[in-house]
Interface confidence: medium
């Protein structure tokens, strides 16, 4: 089990580092988006794990961005960002087989309502229970 957890961590960290770099290979990214969405978490250890991902970086005040799957839907009543940005992207999390192009990458500023906690502990719990 410890070996499995180490392997999982390696895969996840690599997925985060390479997020969005290859539009033809998105299965791992979409799976990880699904994990974040379902477990209500963001990143492996912390949301800051996403800050190293070049394709998510904006400029200036938008330098820190994370995938939309990090967005805490229950924490906002901003219907504009929900309807126009978040929900259309999150709806695809139910259809993981669908291919995605880099232009479709949904990212939100870290300043918005994103999950506070990394996914490591939740995933490890899930592994222990299955």
């Amino acid at each position: 089990r410890a070996q499995l957890e180490r392997s999982l961590r390696d895969v996840v960290e690599k997925t985060i580092q390479k997020y969005g770099t290859n539009p033809e290979e998105t299965a791992a990214e979409e799976s990880w988006d699904y994990v974040q969405f379902q477990l209500r978490c963001c990143g492996w250890h912390y949301p800051q794990d996403w800050f190293q991902v070049l394709i998510l970086r904006g400029n200036g005040s938008e330098a820190h961005r994370v995938p939309c799957s990090c967005y805490n839907l229950s924490a906002t009543n901003d219907s504009t960002i929900l309807d126009k940005v978040i929900l259309p992207q999150l709806s695809r999390l139910g259809h993981l087989a669908r291919s995605r192009h880099s232009a479709d990458i949904c990212a939100v500023p870290a300043e918005s309502h994103i999950y506070r906690e990394g996914c490591a502990q939740g995933l490890q719990k899930w592994l222990h229970n299955n």
Epitope: R40, C42, Q48, A110, R116, Q121
Partner: antibody, heavy 115, light 110 residues
Framework: SVEESGGRLVTPGTPLTLTCTVS????????MNWVRQAPGKGLEWIGI?????RTDYASWAKGRFTISKTSTTVELKITSPTTEDTATYFC?????????????WGPGTLVTVSS | AYDMTQTPSSVEAAVGGTVTIKCQAS??????LAWYQQKPGQPPQLLIH???TLASGVPSRFKGSGSGTQFTLTISGVQSDDAATYYC????????????FGGGTEVVVK
């Protein structure tokens, strides 16, 4: 609401466990922080327990404190108290969203460590 | 390490005057900063979160501003009830931290 209990006079080296009882919200979706305040001093962050049960501690608090939880309580164990641990201990809720602040706070419980 | 430096440690203000308290983070914390008010014998109370958002029930004379590493709490039209100690706290990181709080600023109202 949030309420701490368990504070009392203890002798140095005697382990002490403080309890924070919560109502009106779920520990499954909220993180909880422990903060202390020595008499006449400022606020000092001790650590946090996340919704998943993962914990983080202030660098000075590692090994000196242990945070754990049940479905409705959060515990802070002071493993080997010294006189420097004399303080009022607060627990406070933090939401599940990054950037959430500490609210509400409990009234605090006083720990006095003296021989 | 995300150390928080708060200045001044104490300030006097006249009723109706303005108080400015500054908080500096040692690294960029985006806007993950909160301000608390604490009166003697009471727990801290949340005033402002996300650097500038007023907590529920907090009077509009309290204003938070700033982002990155520099933050300010301004109390305009100071009232005698504002006499308290004010603390800033970073909410950006809990990893390898000495303290998430600033050292506090005592506001004395004349």
């Amino acid at each position: 609401s949030v309420e701490e209990s368990g504070g009392r006079l203890v002798t140095p080296g005697t382990p002490l466990t403080l309890t924070c009882t919560v109502s009106g919200f779920s520990l499954s979706y909220n993180a909880m922080n422990w903060v202390r305040q020595a008499p006449g001093k400022g606020l000092e962050w001790i650590g946090i327990i996340f919704a998943s049960g993962r914990t983080d501690y202030a660098s000075w608090a590692k090994g000196r404190f242990t945070i754990s939880k049940t479905s409705t309580t959060v515990e802070l164990k002071i493993t080997s108290p010294t006189t420097e641990d004399t303080a009022t201990y607060f627990c406070a809720r933090e939401g599940s969203t990054w950037g959430d602040a500490l609210d509400p706070w409990g009234p605090g419980t006083l720990v006095t460590v003296s021989s | 390490a995300y150390d928080m430096t708060q200045t001044p440690s104490s300030v006097e203000a006249a009723v109706g005057g303005t108080v400015t308290i500054k908080c500096q983070a040692s690294q960029n914390i985006i806007d993950y900063l909160a301000w608390y008010q604490q009166k003697p014998g009471q727990p801290p109370q949340l005033l402002i979160h996300k650097a500038s958002t007023l907590a529920s029930g907090v009077p509009s004379r309290f204003k938070g501003s700033g982002s990155g590493t520099q933050f300010t709490l301004t109390i305009s039209g100071v009232q005698s009830d504002d006499a308290a100690t004010y603390y800033c706290q970073q909410g950006y990181s809990n990893s390898n931290i000495d303290n998430t709080f600033g050292g506090g600023t005592e506001v004395v109202v004349k």
